[in-house]
Amino acid sequence: YNNFRKSMDSIGKKQYQVQHGSCSYTFLLPEMDNCRSSSSPYVSNAVQRDAPLEYDDSVQRLQVLENIMENNTQWLMKLENYIQDNMKKEMVEIQQNAVQNQTAVMIEIGTNLLNQTAEQTRKLTDVEAQVLNQTTRLELQLLEHSLSTNKLEKQILDQTSEINKLQDKNSFLEKKVLAMEDKHIIQLQSIKEEKDQLQVLVSKQNSIIEELEKKIVTATVNNSVLQKQQHDLMETVNNLLTMMSTSNSAKDPTVAKEEQISFRDCAEVFKSGHTTNGIYTLTFPNSTEEIKAYCDMEAGGGGWTIIQRREDGSVDFQRTWKEYKVGFGNPSGEYWLGNEFVSQLTNQQRYVLKIHLKDWEGNEAYSLYEHFYLSSEELNYRIHLKGLTGTAGKISSISQPGNDFSTKDGDNDKCICKCSQMLTGGWWFDACGPSNLNGMYYPQRQNTNKFNGIKWYYWKGSGYSLKATTMMIRPADF
């Protein structure tokens, strides 16, 4: 034979070719990509598993058949050589023998050769048939294994991608949880700080309550003494009146009474010639009821009625509805003039409102509203403002449209919480809104990060508590 070739065909099957004389025998064996022999190194992310026993068996049998084939091929080669040798010898004999015997001998030899060749061909055909059957079975089995492996690999890939997705989701959730934990810790710290502040406030309030209780006891004692003194005085006055009526019965009883000049606001006081800063007595519109107010007769042309002042934290602004209605504090220091008076006054004519602010760094600013009035008590002294100008922010720190007034005992804000209790002080709270000039007073360097301080958001931000504030009103036509 000429050669023995082992190669790969185009569809990935292993090809065995045996060339024997003019005859060529070709065996095609399947070799799938995912089925590797143990000798070939192959790394895969697929799950490793044992090869099916049946498959190993078939491979072994195929190897045996290959060996048989090779032996047969060897045997045929030997046979061919033997025939050629014999033919040479016989050819010599034939040449030596008589010419007449030559044709008969030739025919006999040819017949022998043909018989032997036919026998070998039959054997080879049987072997080929066996090999083809075996390879077909192997092809089917390998195909099944390949399909099963592909299916498994697909499942594994699906599971891997699912695991990756879950891992991504898990890491995302872990980050989220960590972020929430951080946020939670910050919130807890903030709550703890607020709690500490509240505890400090509560303990302070307790001591104030104790002091007040003592004062009440003293006041009660003083009151009973005063009542006795008053009673005695009344008796003396009655006696004097009796004496006077008896001794001066001939005289004219009419007494000339000095006419009392009353002022509605500081603008009227200013126009009457009083141009000095100070405390003046004002009269409620259409009433004889009086109220003391501080008049600023110098700033911006004078005539300003001060309706609120904060400067040193000496007055507690966490007051009741009634206290904010009638006013409290000291007009020469920290005070609130009173919602009822301001409401009545600002509904008589048009007023402007000026809010003057000071921070702890020596800066000053103001907000001026060209029209200001308060609704009546029935409408919770709602604030109405128009036309903002000034240096304390381009946006109004008093929420627009105006809100109702709220106090610790009169919750009229837009929050489910109680802004007045939480932020302290009475104010026109929204929910809770960007300002509160009646908040807790905090001194220098302790005035930042204070949620319940004296706030004017659009000038100093939310956590900054101001040093001083003044709210003042004046007629628009002054």
């Epitope: 700080e193 302070k204 000496s314 007055v315 807790m440 007073y441 001194p443 360097r445 302790q446 990060n449």
Partner: antibody, heavy 119, light 111 residues
Framework: EVQLVESGGGLVQPGGSLRLSCAAS????????MSWVRQAPGKGLEWLGE????????NYAPSLKGRFTISRDNAKNSLYLQMNSLRAEDTAVYYC????????????WGQGTLVTVSS | DIQLTQSPSFLSASVGDRVTITCRAS??????????MHWYQQKPGKAPKLLIF???NLESGVPSRFSGSGSGTEFTLTISSLQPEDFATYYC?????????FGQGTKVEIK
């Protein structure tokens, strides 16, 4: 645990200069105001000045008349006091102190470093 | 500057005694919410230690025999039952406005 450790003290001649350091640990130094306080031998406590976390605000006691400078390096967790034109009356133990978060009481102090101004 | 005056400057007492130290400010250092006065204890060779903050709040880890009170301009530190480890110098400090100042100190000695 909050720890403040002063260093840099020693003997210096009148008119001389000295730079004190305060190494902070156990808290987020970059979030806190810091102060310097001194105590002359047998005398009371005297607050010298303070610096805010960003070094944008520094407040001094009026008595120092610009001779002392407070600075800080947040990356090194360190506070500094540069003292110039030193006088005999500057002899004292110098403390760095941390005020509380919300109110100015000093809840953490260093052990102090002694500065002696003498010829 | 706000001046703080402590009285007495020296105080001799025995273990178990009730001791009261006063601190007067030259200006009001209280609001309706807080009193900005704080108390410290200092032992020889040591740094001061915070006892009371905002007039009446006990610093954590400080024994309950220490208490503070007062508002406005007058404040007191009270030790209900003096212990051997309480013999030291006590200082008040305000935080109403810059500069922060300390009292001159009250030295509590063993009688």
């Amino acid at each position: 645990e909050v720890q403040l450790v002063e260093s840099g003290g020693g003997l210096v001649q009148p008119g001389g200069s000295l730079r004190l350091s305060c190494a902070a640990s156990g808290f987020d130094f970059s979030r806190h105001w810091m102060s310097w306080v001194r105590q002359a031998p047998g005398k009371g406590l005297e607050w010298l000045g303070e610096i805010n976390p960003e070094s944008t605000t520094i407040n001094y006691a009026p008595s120092l008349k610009g001779r002392f400078t407070i600075s800080r390096d947040n990356a090194k967790n360190s506070l500094y006091l540069q003292m110039n034109s030193l006088r005999a009356e500057d002899t004292a133990v110098y403390y760095c102190a941390r005020p509380g978060d919300d109110f100015i009481y000093f809840d953490s102090w260093g052990q102090g470093t002694l500065v002696t101004v003498s010829s | 500057d706000i001046q703080l005056t402590q009285s007495p400057s020296f105080l001799s007492a025995s273990v178990g005694d009730r001791v009261t130290i006063t601190c007067r400010a030259s200006k009001r250092v209280s609001t309706s919410g807080h009193s900005y006065m704080h108390w410290y204890q200092q032992k020889p060779g040591k740094a001061p230690k915070l006892l009371i903050f905002l007039a009446s709040n006990l610093e954590s880890g400080v024994p309950s025999r220490f208490s503070g009170s007062g508002s406005g301009t007058e404040f007191t530190l009270t030790i209900s039952s003096l212990q051997p480890e309480d013999f030291a110098t006590y200082y008040c400090q305000h935080s109403w406005e810059l500069p922060w100042t300390f009292g001159q100190g009250t030295k509590v000695e063993i009688k």
